[in-house]
Interface confidence: medium
Amino acid sequence: MGNSCYNIVATLLLVLNFERTRSLQDPCSNCPAGTFCDNNRNQICSPCPPNSFSSAGGQRTCDICRQCKGVFRTRKECSSTSNAECDCTPGFHCLGAGCSMCEQDCKQGQELTKKGCKDCCFGTFNDQKRGICRPWTNCSLDGKSVLVNGTKERDVVCGPSPADLSPGASSVTPPAPAREPGHSPQIISFFLALTSTALLFLLFFLTLRFSVVKRGRKKLLYIFKQPFMRPVQTTQEEDGCSCRFPEEEEGGCEL
């Protein structure tokens, strides 16, 4: 026990002695952050000149501060111990490590191309001021139907499968979809309204079924089927929209 204690004390003394010797041999190691070891002045610690910094001790030079020029603006001023930090002027956002570039903002429903901001093409959307237009969700891949059509700014909203909504289905009330995070009360209200409508249609259908002539009945059945057909995903089509196809880096949209 006493032997190990002696070893620890001996090690500590060695370390302390080494540090003291090192600082005697290299006076620069004593220079704190915000200073540099000035060889021209007998290795004394001089403060960093204006517009420069040293973030660690023992440095022989200070680094020039980053300059936030042009479209960049200063987010954090340079100090003697830390570099300046830049961000972008309004209407632009940062790109790259440490905001090495600024990129122009676009409106929702647009993406930035080499020719500037362009509207998202039919079938794509962008709900942010940056980034690219992404394709609408394909509801049918999950066996669902489109509840709310997609736009340039918003993705489609998928709902229960068409089978769950058809009037001839065994269950009158469609199964409540698992609520995804971010679903608003409006969508829940929409489902409730849809259920009520389905019930009303069913009652209306049963009432008229026996009182309508054969030809008229066929026509009526056609009308009933319409609301349950998969809606066409529509959006405002504008000239100069931006289409991005896998084989093209950038393509115009000939609609």
Partner: antibody, heavy 121, light 106 residues
């Protein structure tokens, strides 16, 4: 098409003055993020940045070698950039290029064809 | 000011060769580095910006890499039209260029 065209170069005696112009077309010099710069190249030598002006025109930058002698300015109504060269020295002899700082950064994406300034007695 | 040192200052190569040019900054500059190509009597042309982003219209045989103090321009397969002088440029603090690297025909 985005283009920069320099003019105003020529032969001048040491101590003399000259005014270089750079006419921009295809883009506006007054656009917020666009900076414009002058870069020179002495015969057979490398490129040397001389001066820059920010998109708003509120900030100017100069290389130490020309500070106090050269002045950068612009006329947004004419969409033209200028460089006033005073107290010219033999070492200022070079082809002077104007170049657009890329809208989103700090590099030069559009260059003019250059104009030659010769300082000699 | 921030100094940029290019190496080599000149090199001889043949068509099809892989060519590498390096640029060293006197201090860390993040990725604030661009590369230009200049042919005799012509203005420089931007090739690479932000250390590794290829400028629109520039062939994909040109590539850039690096960050901090050490940067590289690579031409994967040298073409006849690539014989020129190449410059690096920093925009971290004001603007400075490297001294240039001349690529000549072997």
């Amino acid at each position: 098409e985005v283009q920069l065209v320099e003019s105003g170069g020529g032969l001048v005696q040491p101590g003399g003055s000259l005014r270089l112009s750079c006419a921009a077309s295809g883009f506006s010099l007054s656009t917020g993020g666009v900076g414009v710069s002058w870069i020179r190249q002495a015969p057979g030598k490398g490129l040397e940045w001389v001066s820059s002006i920010s998109g708003s025109g509120g900030t100017t930058y100069y290389a130490d070698s020309v500070k106090g002698r050269f002045t950068i300015s612009r006329d947004n109504s004419k969409n033209t950039l200028y460089l006033q060269l005073n107290s010219l020295r033999a070492e200022d002899t070079a082809v002077y290029y104007c170049a657009r700082d890329d809208l989103y950064s700090w590099y030069f994406d559009v260059w003019g064809q250059g104009t030659l300034v010769t300082v000699s007695s | 000011d921030i100094q940029l040192t290019q190496s080599p200052s000149s090199l001889s190569a043949s068509v099809g060769d892989r060519v590498t040019i390096t640029c060293r900054a006197s201090q860390g500059i993040g990725s604030s580095l661009a590369w230009y190509q200049q042919k005799p009597g012509k203005a420089p042309k931007l090739l690479i910006y932000a250390a590794s982003s290829l400028q629109s219209g520039v062939p994909s045989r040109f590539s850039g890499s690096g960050s901090g103090t050490d940067f590289t321009l690579t031409i994967s397969s040298l073409q006849p039209e690539d014989f020129a002088t190449y410059y690096c440029q920093q925009g971290y603090y004001t603007w400075t260029f490297g001294q240039g690297t001349k690529v000549e025909i072997k």
